[in-house]
């Protein structure tokens, strides 16, 4: 992963069976936030295990999170976003371990779309477009991307470029020609809010044009 | 090792309706966006709908409002409804499945074999 990624829980650095990390998205659904958790240890029983928050919360005290098969979530309008949330894993009344955590440092964007690669034949160049939800959310609205792009048939030989505009320009000259290539974007927060990579984009395929062999250029695609 | 399994292609004439379905052999994490690709004869492989846990569907513009993704988290099954169907969404289908990890899972990205769907009269 990328020098970028931080981890809002570092502050527990106790590991028992019942570790936990959890992940915020601001504005996931309308004025609706979400926070989503789960067991380190993907063996644990989770059977009669809940999770709880409190504090930090507006209207309430504790909210309860809901569970689908092994992960935990809620989705509400009453994070405050201004200091820490006590979040506790939790047998009946029992608390069995808790983390103190500030959910503006746990964000996880939501994953970035219409990813586009357009060939400018006079140019020379691709240009790589793609969308995020972000730009149009009062709160994770500034953002790093990491577009990476690889010949399909080179399984982990990736090319990363960080950016922080939606746009981007790729020089066919630093491009194998008539080769494949995926391509594909995620998002990290970058201004006041700290967290996690979003998940991938889908990828772009593309084909990039044969060397015209009389000039020594590409041909177009 | 996850195997997907795709079922519902087909041929089928212009402007009918065909289901895809993609099946999980085993257990993935409830997380990970499901995600279907076409490719068709001497293209490239292309995007066409994804969907979230939490049932966030995104669509390529060329399906919009023809195409309905829909996913079963406790089953880990994913369904494509295609309506309106023209020659040229033509192709093989593939399911694919994908975390970019966190929450102490490692990533991962599994594909299907594909279904091959064929809109012609």
């Known amino acids: 992963e990328s020098g970028y990624a931080q981890n809002g829980d570092l502050e527990d650095a106790e590991l028992d069976d019942y570790s936990f990390s959890c992940y915020s998205q601001l504005e996931v659904n309308g004025s609706q936030h979400s926070l989503t958790c789960a067991f380190e240890d993907p063996d644990v029983n989770i059977t009669n295990l809940e999770f709880e928050i409190c504090g930090a919360l507006v209207e309430v005290k504790c909210l309860n999170f809901r569970k689908l098969q092994e992960i935990y979530f809620i989705e509400t309008k009453k994070f405050l976003l201004i200091g820490k949330s006590n979040i506790c894993v939790k047998v009946g009344e029992k608390s069995l371990t808790c983390k103190k955590i500030d959910l503006t440092t746990i964000v996880k964007p939501e994953a970035p779309f219409d990813l586009s690669v357009v060939y400018r034949e006079g140019a020379n160049d691709f240009v790589v477009t793609f969308n995020t939800s972000h730009l149009q959310k009062k709160y994770v609205k500034v953002l790093m991307h990491d577009v990476a792009y690889r010949q399909e048939k080179d399984e982990n030989k990736w090319t990363h470029v960080n950016l922080s505009s939606t746009k981007l320009t790729l020089l066919q000259r630093k491009l194998q020609p008539a080769a494949m290539y995926e391509i594909k974007v995620r998002s990290i927060p970058d201004h006041y809010f700290k967290g996690f990579w979003s998940e991938w984009s889908p990828s772009y395929y593309f084909r990039t044009p044969e060397i015209n062999n009389s000039s020594g250029e590409m041909d177009p695609i | 090792q996850v195997q997907l399994v795709e079922s519902g292609g087909g041929l089928v004439q212009p402007g009918g309706s065909l289901r895809l379905s993609c099946a999980t052999s085993?257990?993935?994490?409830?997380?990970?966006?499901m995600t279907w690709y076409r490719q068709a004869p001497g293209k490239t492989r292309e995007f066409v709908a994804a969907?979230?846990?939490?049932?966030?569907?995104t669509y390529a513009e060329s399906v919009k409002g023809r195409f309905t993704i829909s996913r079963d988290n406790a089953k880990n099954t994913m369904d494509l409804q295609m309506d309106g169907l023209k020659p040229e969404d033509t192709a093989v289908y593939y399911c694919?499945?994908?975390w970019g990890g966190g929450l102490n899972r490692a990533p991962f990205d599994y594909w299907g074999q594909g279904t091959q769907v064929t809109v012609s009269s």
């Open positions: 694919n499945v994908k």
């Open positions: 969907i979230t846990w939490r049932g966030a569907a």
């Open positions: 085993g257990s993935i994490f409830s997380l990970a966006t």
